[in-house]
Interface confidence: low
């Protein structure tokens, strides 16, 4: 039994501090007590802490830790969430413009093919949007369907406009002939190659960004173990039990504790680094036929060329098809009846190239540069959190978990902790199931990113498992987005003008007093915050 404390040795300071954590003083002793029931802040003498206080300190310590982790990841989380939304929207806008350019090409050059062509073009670009967002659609089928649908209209409206209505029954025959006679030359094949390569890469890029968000969200909301809670309590609060209110934990001690608490999280580091580097490799290869902006915005030109190719061969085609499809009601069309490769386009086809000053590719590179500054995010977390919580500089006159020391010694601290619990054991437990799951997902996306990276390897036709979403932002009035020039061709302007659509904001003063749950750590992309702020790739 320790001797009673001198009359002036009260727990007044501890009481006033604890009241800020927990209103009411029923748990705080008025004068120091033996504290034999304490399990974390094991006393060397009389203490101003009770078991109930200790429990409250543990809860507060774990909450503090969660908040520190969330504020540590705030900037990174905001960067990825904002960019995922911006790129997704930008890709949808590219699709919308590509559709509008294609519709305008038909309207200006082949007015007799509208509105059927608009319908087929609309369906094609809806499929493009769905594909980008993960829907299980085959790109070759999309392109084939576009040309299969267009050819009967081209044949009946442009090549043989005098056909009676009853002859419209030949549509199925014409669809079949389209492929077997290669009526569009190699243009459909060219479009398949360009579109599939560029869309696969775009899709994996979006999928990777969405997974990045999931990684941050997972680690952002980790619940720390009781062991970690005890370590944090000992570091941040046990000094109060001895009346040492102004003492800060030793920096070295903080690092040891944080490494213990975050051992599982730090295991993500290797895969996170690989994720950023693989994403960089993907982005570096997203040009020419691997750049959906370049490919889709040039499609109108390739489709135009393909129709001109048909027109050039109209004479031979009309004769051949006239014979083949004249009695299509009587007999089924059979590809075996017709010579293969009747009209093969021998000339080398150039990729339609759209000139513009600045494109999404520069935005992607900008994002990668910013992401690379977070490449050590997970390995640096313990140090970051210690540097953003109160610690004593130079490890002098600081708290080591048990007492005030003049200089921190890791060995002494470890020895002192042995009876309480083993730091090494905490590290050995391995990552939590949610962390293991996110590591598996990172491994999977890294594998995908590696197989998709250009130009080293071929783009594999992977069926990615992200779900699809219809773009839905397409105005069907093509004149709203683009005007045809006098000669019937379309001038493609700097594409960043349409990205301006993404930068509009909903002014915060539109929502007076609307601050529920809006803490500084919540600075993510939001309908109620200016998208053009902070890390906006539109600035």
């Amino acid at each position: 039994q320790p001797p009673p404390p001198p009359p002036d040795a009260t727990c007044h300071q501890v009481r006033s501090f604890f009241q800020r954590l927990q209103p009411g003083l029923k748990w705080v002793p008025e004068t120091p007590v033996p504290g034999s029931d304490l399990q974390v802040c094991l006393p060397k003498g009389p203490t101003c802490c009770s078991r109930k206080m200790e429990e409250k300190y543990q809860l507060t310590a774990r909450l503090n830790m969660e908040q520190l982790l969330q504020s540590a990841s705030m900037e990174l989380k905001f960067l990825i969430i904002q960019n995922a939304a911006v790129f997704q929207e930008a890709f949808e806008i590219v699709v919308r413009h590509a559709k509008n350019y294609t519709n305008a090409m038909f309207k200006n050059n082949y007015p007799s093919l509208t509105p059927q062509a608009f319908e087929f073009v609309g369906e094609f670009f809806t499929d493009v949007s769905l594909y980008i967002l993960g829907s299980d659609i085959n790109v070759d089928d999309m392109v084939n369907e576009l040309f299969d649908s267009l050819f009967p209209v081209i044949y009946t409206q442009l090549m043989n406009p005098g056909l009676p209505d009853s002859a419209l029954d030949i549509n199925e025959c014409l669809r079949g002939a389209r492929r077997d006679l290669k009526v569009f030359g190699n243009f459909p094949k060219l479009i398949m190659t360009q579109v599939s390569k560029s869309l696969q890469v775009t899709r994996i890029f979006l999928q990777a960004l969405n997974l990045g968000i999931e990684v941050i969200n997972t680690t952002d909301h980790l619940k720390f173990s009781k062991d970690c809670g005890r370590m944090l309590t000992r570091m941040w609060y046990c000094s109060y039990c001895q009346g040492l209110m102004m003492v800060k934990p030793c920096g070295g001690y903080c690092n040891v504790v944080m490494q213990g608490c975050m051992a599982g999280v730090v295991e993500i580091d290797k895969y996170w680094r690989e994720y950023i580097l693989s994403l960089e490799e993907l982005v570096n290869g997203m040009y020419r036929i691997y750049d959906m902006e370049n490919v889709l915005l040039g499609l109108f030109s390739t489709i135009h060329d393909s129709i001109q190719y048909v027109q050039k061969n109209a004479g031979k085609l009309t004769t051949t098809i006239g014979k083949l499809c004249a009695h299509s009601q009587q007999r089924q069309y059979r590809s075996a009846y017709y010579p293969e490769d009747l009209f093969i386009d021998k000339k080398v086809l150039k990729v339609a190239h759209v000139e513009h000053e600045e494109t999404l590719s520069s935005r992607r590179r900008e994002l990668i540069q910013k992401l690379k500054s977070f490449i050590s995010f997970y390995s640096a977390l313990p140090g970051y959190i210690c540097s953003h919580s109160p610690v004593a500089e130079n490890d002098t006159l600081c708290w080591n978990g048990q007492e005030l020391v003049e200089r921190y010694s890791q060995k002494a601290a470890r020895n002192g902790m042995k009876n309480q619990f083993n730091l090494h054991e905490l590290k050995m437990k391995g990552p939590e199931p949610v962390v293991s799951q996110i590591i598996d997902k990172l491994k999977h996306i890294n594998q995908l990113l590696r197989t998709m990276s250009m130009p080293k390897g071929r783009v594999l036709d992977k069926n990615l498992d992200e779900e699809g979403f219809e773009s839905g932002d397409c105005g069907d009035d093509e004149d709203e987005c683009i005007g045809g020039s006098g000669d019937g061709m379309i001038k493609v302007k700097n594409q960043l003008r349409f990205l301006a659509e993404l930068a509009y904001d909903l002014d915060v003063d539109d929502a007076p007093g609307n601050s529920q749950q809006a803490t500084p750590k919540d600075n993510e992309i939001s309908t109620f915050h200016n998208l053009g702020n902070v890390h906006s790739p539109l600035k």
């Epitope: 989380k77 969430i81 995922a84 939304a85 997704q88 929207e89 949808e92 967002l133 993960g134 979006l206 969405n210 968000i213 999931e214 969200n217 992200e466 779900e467 699809g468 979403f469 219809e470 839905g472 932002d473 105005g475 009035d477 709203e480 659509e501 993404l502 509009y504 904001d505 909903l506 002014d507 539109d510 929502a511 609307n514 529920q516 749950q517 809006a518 750590k521 919540d522 600075n523 993510e524 992309i525 939001s526 309908t527 109620f528 915050h529 998208l531």
Partner: antibody, heavy 120, light 112 residues
Framework: EVQLVESGGGLVKPGGSLKLSCAAS????????MSWVRQTPEKRLEWVAY????????YYPDSVKGRFTISRDNAKNTLYLQMSSLKSEDTAMYYC?????????????WGQGTLVTVSA | DVVMTQTPLSLPVSLGDQASISCRSS???????????LHWYLQKPGQSPKLLIY???NRFSGVPDRFSGSGSGTDFTLKISRVEAEDLGVYFC?????????FGGGTKLEIK
Amino acid sequence: EVQLVESGGGLVKPGGSLKLSCAASGFAFITYGMSWVRQTPEKRLEWVAYISSGGANTYYPDSVKGRFTISRDNAKNTLYLQMSSLKSEDTAMYYCASLSTLVRGWFAYWGQGTLVTVSA
Amino acid sequence: DVVMTQTPLSLPVSLGDQASISCRSSQSLVHSNGNTYLHWYLQKPGQSPKLLIYKVSNRFSGVPDRFSGSGSGTDFTLKISRVEAEDLGVYFCSQSTHVPYTFGGGTKLEIK
């Protein structure tokens, strides 16, 4: 195909609580702001809650502020609306709706709705 | 809050006729960024609302071209060039220029 499926509606007494859920599929849920919109028996539509893509920012009109809480679980692709201190004027069909990806969005897709009846 | 007023409350039409619905806001819907966030939704009997037109005149994907939107400032109109049976239902206008977003009271399009 985009799908939003609400559940959790039912009959509740004034002052009671109810939690609605909305399961989303067919789109990248994690990058979309989401809302709850209700339709009164008189068929008037009222926007009752908004939550940003990552779940950090929320908004409520004065009529429900302090009583309703919107939340989301991006891992489960699910949106929630916790309603407490319910009043008879909260009786309505509750729809969850995805905002377009653009800021100041419009409600691009709606669920089929779940009916909440507040009555003694 | 911005009040959205729709007229008429009910609109009886014959199939094939043109229909016109008006929507007026209590304050201008032109945002400081120049955009006007006025949208139209259709709710068919027994269904949830569906987006038809966004930002005054842009048709949402899959919406037939017989639907068109126009207007500026505080006065807006939805026109259906040739009403078809599938167009029947309640039409709502909505604004998202000002927080909170608000809806009009609805216009019921029905067969004469």
